[in-house]
Every structure is written in structure tokens, then in C-alpha cells.
Interface confidence: low
């Protein structure tokens, strides 16, 4: 009679992960008498996963009745299959023996691999903001992944992006991946309202994508465009100037005025208008009582923006020859009106 | 734009194999699943199975498993799949098809490759 | 696998009258996601399938709005709302939601 063979018929079997996996073995012989095992991995450090003869395996369960007579087939299926599950199982047939049994026979092993969904991306952008025309980088990460197969797309505004770097690790044989992308956007003026999304596809997302968005706008400063002008005359001794702080974003800044170079009021913008790209505008007014100088003022818009260096605009407010004239009999009670609407 | 070129048709002999084509253009060829696709004479479509480009990992389904072999050359950005102890029941035309990273699978496919099996 | 039953297999129709293809499948195709994998393709004769709609009842671009797909579960149904000549082919329902991905036997669509 011909020697006992043992029978794996599946190289490999995929299975996604909370699946059970059938892992199939079957003898061509009754003889020699003795239980079956199975294992996964080879040699001397290799998990026992099933022994017919004795034990508690709570999460397998037989395929067919073992103790029916003449039974041949010993596939075993593993129940709410984990990355961890992964490997090559064999199974192992023994001879009966005393005191104990002796390994006979082992089939050519099953590898089990598992199809395991990617976590949600996470988009981080970076710890300090950057102006228009500089570039940034945006990070994308994703754990837990199998097999190791996975598609990382990069788009801004719906437009896919071409300049980034993607490693998927560890680079060998693993229950389970990670995948870590870095991509470098080069921002725009327009850039509060823009979205960087990392869209990830695996074969056990079914075609429907994951993705992790960051927005720019934490990512972004615009620095402000200053405008100082002069509008007409409310009364004739009092001019009244304004700032027009133009296109910034973020919110955060502090305007001070400067007459010939003292410290006439600083304010901090509150009531903002919000521009279509995001980006604000905010005005101040500097009344400025002009019997109270007898010479030119230069008045300075000197504006602070999101803890930056600040930046200034000068304009210099002529005093007319008559004001001049009488502007020894002024006194000073009112060079500074508080700034109001026009 | 995408294009999936297979040629028109192969003419086998019983018994015989056949390694059919499908050269990729117009996007990164190692980053989406192949999926080839059976059409019998006068039948409808049958998925054979799909292969990744960049690990060259492939599954095909239990119909296939002993009938098609699935490989790639990322070099010439082609896939290929060997159909081997061809009979007359073999005689279709194939298809290869493309997967997309979002909704976009079974968009993208080739012309397909007449193979007819016959002494 | 999944079993996608098409009916009728041949549709019959007079160009600008409605048509409807019924498509059922063996089990759920409902996504543990909430979304449902289902296709529609054409064939034109000669040709290769086309992807007509997907996830049930998105059309593809450049899809006339004379198609639309509904459906859920196991029950799926496109509708041509007026026949045109360019229309008829071999139309196939198949489903991503389980692994191997299963076609329908198609259903041929002729001009009266």
C-alpha cells in the first residue's frame, strides 16, 4: 500500500480581516494510526493552532467529523481572522507512539494572507505658517494596511498633485503596513479657502477611497497691502486720514499710528470684512485736529500682523500757510479724535 | 488618456498555451489592478482574476486558478496572461481592464483578443 | 460567488418608447460602508463593455440622463426613459461588493 501523503491543495488563501479562513488538509491513507496537528510556521519555534487529540481551540472549528470513521479530510476553519493570523500553516500528521506520538508526515503549508483596511488617513500640515509662493508640506499617514499593495494620490482642489514622496513599511514580509506620504504645495495668495486631500485605495476599500483632508488656511499667512490716503475735510481744521489694511489673513493684528514718529493710538481689528478668497480687509481713521501743528505731519500706519516683523506706510499731511499762521493761538486739547466711520 | 492595447486575435492549436497582452499607456502602470475578463462566443462576461503591477500579486477566481497564469513586464508597462491546456470550450475573446483609485473600476478596458482554439 | 440574474434576456423596443432591465443578485450587495457596488455596462456590438453607471445610480460622464439606475439590496433596475438607435447592445449588471466580482448574463437590447 502506498505511503501516507498529506495534502494542502492551496498555496495561499486571502481572507479579509473579521472573515473566517478554511485552511484545507486532507490524508490518501488511514495508516499509520495517529492524530493530526496543525501549526503555523516551521520548525522548532511553531504555534500549535489545532490538535485533533486534545486542547481548547475556541476560535477553530473542524471542516468535516473527525471521529468519523475512515474520515480523510482535516481542513480546519479559523474564525474573526487579524493581520496577526497571517503566515504559513501546516498540516501535520503523527504516528502513534509511546510514550508519545511522533511526527510522521507534514503537508507543503498554506500561506494565509490578510486583506486588511488602511485606518483613516491623517493630513498634517505644518507647524508654522508660510507666505504665498513658498512651499509647504503637507504629511499623510495610514497603519494597518494588508496586503501591502495600496495607491496614494495627492490632490489640492480637486487638481492631483505630482510633487511627493511615498514609503510604505517595513519594506519586507509583515503581518500588517504603514504608509507615510509627504507632499510639497506651493501656495497661492487664493490658498485660505484650498483643501490638500490624501486619497488612499486599497483592494479592501472596494473601489470607494479613503481620504484625509487638510485645509491651508492653517497652513497660510497673507500679509497685509497698506494704503494710507486722506479724505475730504469733515470741518476745516480737522483732516481725516485712514489705513486701508488690505487682503490678510490670519485674523490676528494690531495697527498703531504714529504722528512724526510718536505713538498716537493702537488698536486691535476686531470688526473685519471678510474678502471671497478669505483673506480681510480692515480700515482705521486717524482724525487729526491740524490747528494743533504748525508744521507738516508725517503719519505713519505701522501694522503688526500674526507676530510678525511690522510693516508701514507713511503720508505726509501738509498744514496750509493760514493754518500755520494762527496755529501759535491753538492749543493741543484735541490733536486725536477717536477713529469713527466717515 | 488611458489605453489598454491587446492584440486583435491568436489562433492555438488543442493542447497548446498562449500568452495574451495588454499594454498599458497613459498613466502610472505599476499603481492600479489589471483584471482580466473572459467573453465566450455569444456569451456574456466572466471575471478571470487581477494582478497588481508593482508586487506582481495576483488572485484569480477558482474557475481560472488551473487556466490562467497572470504575470507582468513594468519595463514595457504590460501585462500578460498565459492560458495553458487550450480546448476548443477555451475559444473567447479576452479583455483586460483597469481599476481606478476612486468608483472607477471596470471603466477602463482593452479591445479585447479574439483566441480561437482549433486543430 | 455572488449570482447576478439579468431578465428579460432580450428587450424589444421602438425608438423613443421606454425600457426597463431588471438585475438581482444572490446576496446582498450592500457594503459594511453603507454603499452599494453595483455597475451597469454596455456593449455595442463589436465593441468593448462601456461603464454606463455606478454605485447603483451615478451616472458617467457623458451618459445621456435618458439612463437611470435604482435599486437596492438585491433588486436593481435600468431604465431608458426613450430608446434611442445608439442604445442598443448587450447591457450587464456586475458587482464589486463581494470577492470574485460576478457579471450578469447580459440582456440584449433590439430596435423594433
Known amino acids: 500500500e502506498d505511503e501516507l501523503q498529506v495534502i494542502q491543495p492551496e498555496k495561499s488563501v486571502s481572507v479579509a480581516a473579521g472573515e473566517s479562513a478554511t485552511l484545507r488538509c486532507a490524508m490518501t491513507s488511514l495508516i499509520p494510526v495517529g492524530p493530526i496537528m496543525w501549526f503555523r510556521g516551521a520548525g522548532a519555534g511553531r504555534e500549535l493552532i489545532y490538535n485533533q487529540k486534545e486542547g481548547h481551540f475556541p476560535r477553530v472549528t473542524t471542516v468535516s467529523e473527525l471521529t468519523k470513521r475512515n474520515n480523510l479530510d482535516f481542513s480546519i476553519s479559523i474564525s474573526n481572522i487579524t493581520p496577526a493570523d497571517a503566515g504559513t500553516y501546516y498540516c501535520v500528521k503523527f504516528r502513534k507512539g509511546s510514550p508519545d506520538d511522533v511526527e510522521f508526515k507534514s503537508g507543503a503549508g498554506t500561506e494565509l494572507s490578510v486583506r486588511a483596511k488602511p485606518s483613516a488617513p491623517v493630513v498634517s500640515g505644518p507647524a508654522v505658517r508660510a507666505t504665498p509662493e513658498h512651499t509647504v508640506s503637507f504629511t499623510c499617514e495610514s497603519h494597518g494596511f494588508s496586503p501591502r499593495d495600496i495607491t496614494l494620490k495627492w490632490f489640492k482642489n480637486g487638481n492631483e498633485l505630482s510633487d511627493f514622496q511615498t514609503n510604505v513599511d517595513p519594506a519586507g514580509d509583515s503581518v500588517s503596513y504603514s504608509i507615510h506620504s509627504t507632499a510639497r504645495v506651493v501656495l497661492t495668495r487664493g490658498d485660505v479657502h484650498s483643501q490638500v486631500i490624501c486619497e488612499i485605495a486599497h483592494i479592501t476599500l472596494q473601489g470607494d477611497p479613503l481620504r484625509g483632508t487638510a485645509n491651508l488656511s492653517e497652513a497660510i499667512r497673507v500679509p497685509p497691502t497698506l494704503e494710507v490716503t486722506q479724505q475730504p475735510m469733515r470741518a476745516e481744521n480737522q483732516a481725516n486720514v485712514t489705513c486701508q489694511v488690505s487682503n490678510f489673513y490670519p485674523r490676528g493684528l494690531q495697527l498703531t499710528w504714529l504722528e512724526n514718529g510718536n505713538v498716537s493710538r493702537t488698536e486691535t481689528a476686531s470688526t473685519l470684512i471678510e474678502n471671497k478668497d478669505g483673506t480681510y480687509n480692515w480700515m482705521s481713521w486717524l482724525l487729526v485736529n491740524t490747528c494743533a501743528h504748525r508744521d507738516d505731519v508725517v503719519l505713519t500706519c505701522q501694522v503688526e500682523h500674526d507676530g510678525q516683523q511690522a510693516v508701514s506706510k507713511s503720508y505726509a499731511l501738509e498744514i496750509s500757510a493760514h493754518q500755520k499762521e494762527h496755529g501759535s493761538d491753538i492749543t493741543h486739547e484735541a490733536a486725536l479724535a477717536p477713529t469713527a466711520p466717515l | 488618456q488611458v489605453q489598454l492595447q491587446q492584440p486583435r486575435a491568436e489562433l492555438v492549436k488543442p493542447g497548446a498555451s498562449v500568452m495574451l497582452s495588454c499594454k498599458a499607456s497613459g498613466y502610472t502602470f505599476s499603481s492600479y489592478w489589471i483584471h482580466w475578463v473572459r467573453q465566450g462566443p455569444g456569451q456574456g462576461l466572466e471575471w478571470i482574476g487581477l494582478?497588481?503591477?508593482?508586487?506582481?500579486?495576483?488572485d484569480c477566481s477558482e474557475t481560472f486558478k488551473n487556466k490562467a497564469t497572470l504575470t507582468v513586464d513594468t519595463s514595457s508597462s504590460t501585462a500578460y496572461m498565459q492560458l495553458s491546456s487550450l480546448a476548443s470550450e477555451d475559444s473567447a475573446v479576452y479583455y483586460c481592464a483597469r481599476d481606478g483609485a476612486s468608483y472607477d473600476w471596470f471603466v477602463h478596458w482593452g479591445q479585447g483578443t479574439l483566441v480561437t482554439v482549433s486543430a | 460567488d455572488v449570482v447576478m440574474t439579468q431578465t428579460p434576456l432580450t428587450l424589444s423596443v421602438t425608438i423613443g418608447q421606454p425600457a426597463s432591465i431588471s438585475c438581482k443578485s444572490s446576496?446582498?450587495?450592500?457594503?459594511?460602508?453603507?454603499?452599494?457596488?453595483l455597475n451597469w455596462l454596455l456593449q455595442r456590438p463589436g465593441q468593448s463593455p462601456k461603464r454606463l453607471i455606478y454605485?447603483?445610480?451615478k451616472l458617467d460622464s457623458g451618459v445621456p440622463d435618458r439612463f437611470t439606475g435604482s435599486g437596492s439590496g438585491t433588486d436593481f433596475t435600468l431604465k431608458i426613459s426613450r430608446v434611442e438607435a445608439e442604445d442598443l447592445g448587450v447591457y450587464y449588471c456586475v458587482q464589486g461588493t463581494h470577492f470574485p466580482r460576478t457579471f450578469g448574463g447580459g440582456t440584449k437590447l433590439e430596435i423594433k
Open positions: 446576496q446582498s450587495l450592500l457594503y459594511t460602508n453603507g454603499k452599494t457596488y
Open positions: 494582478i497588481h503591477p508593482n508586487s506582481g500579486n495576483t
Open positions: 454605485l447603483v445610480s
